[in-house]
């Protein structure tokens, strides 16, 4: 049995509430903390030893419609002289997140949860494979 953390309470549905089909819910697409301040990035995507670019992907049948994906700019990593060292590897850092997929069934519209793999940035790693001649 899960115990709520301090300051948390589990929602208890009153017994008088009508029953809802299992696995479905009512959804408010308004966002809590919508104006939360994002800390300054200070261009870390350019200053990193494994720099990356951002691309905005757009899908009108997904919520959120806009998802930002990162792409590693290099195969290797950038050394102190600004040169690419291919004996180190730039690799993507990925986060699996849930989005809502809009489904049209006749006149009704519903949403289904969908897993989405988001690349948030890149990092530099030592290679696991060393070529032996």
């Amino acid at each position: 049995q899960r115990v709520p953390k301090e300051g948390q309470t589990f929602f208890q549905k009153p017994e008088s509430c009508p029953s809802v089909p299992e696995g479905s819910l009512k959804l408010d697409l308004g966002i809590i903390n919508a104006n939360q301040r994002v800390p300054l990035s200070r261009n870390i995507e350019r200053r990193s030893t494994s720099p990356w670019n951002y691309t905005v992907t757009w899908d009108p049948n997904r919520y959120p419609s806009e998802v930002v994906q990162a792409q590693c700019r290099h195969l290797g990593c950038v050394n102190a002289q600004g040169k690419e060292d291919i004996f180190m590897n730039s690799v993507p850092i990925q986060q699996e997140t849930l989005v809502l997929r809009r489904k049209h069934q006749g006149c009704s519209v519903s949403f289904q949860l969908e897993k989405l793999l988001v690349t948030v940035g890149c990092t530099c790693v030592k290679p696991l494979i060393h070529h032996v001649h």
């Epitope: 990356w52 670019n53 290099h74 195969l75 494979i129």
Partner: nanobody, 123 residues
Framework: DVQLVESGGGLVQPGGSLRLSCAAS????????VGWFRQAPGKEREFIGA????????YYAVSEKGRFTISRDNSKNTLYLQMNSLRPEDTAVYYC????????????????WGQGTLVTVSS
């Protein structure tokens, strides 16, 4: 998972050109390093080159630099190999490959491979 399908192979005369394509489907294409290998009859698989997720960084095997050009179009989930001044010794099955780490791909240890497309250079 990522599925890779090569196309564009065929018979070409010496000195001719050919452009191979590799269509990817599945997970985010732009998060993968992608590249090309080839395998001539009776020989080991040989690394041709690779390109970073954004397409800004390209690495070629020394032997192929100049004649072969690798590019990618992330909006089309496609990798390309432009081959010029083809010679009979370029006859091989050409494979497209993908991995999140260049070090794995470079030494033929990629997670994903296409089925290959045959290129024959002959008069």
């Amino acid at each position: 998972d990522v599925q890779l399908v090569e196309s564009g192979g065929g018979l070409v005369q010496p000195g001719g050109s050919l452009r191979l394509s590799c269509a990817a489907s599945g997970r985010t294409f732009s998060s993968y390093v992608v590249g090309w290998f080839r395998q001539a009859p009776g020989k080991e698989r040989e690394f041709i080159g690779a390109i970073s997720g954004s397409g800004e960084s390209i690495y070629y095997a020394v032997s192929e630099k100049g004649r072969f050009t690798i590019s990618r179009d992330n909006s089309k989930n496609t990798l390309y190999l432009q081959m010029n001044s083809l010679r009979p010794e370029d006859t091989a099955v050409y494979y497209c490959t993908a991995d999140q780490e260049f070090g794995y791909l470079r030494f033929g240890r990629s997670e994903y491979w296409g089925q290959g497309t045959l290129v024959t250079v002959s008069s």
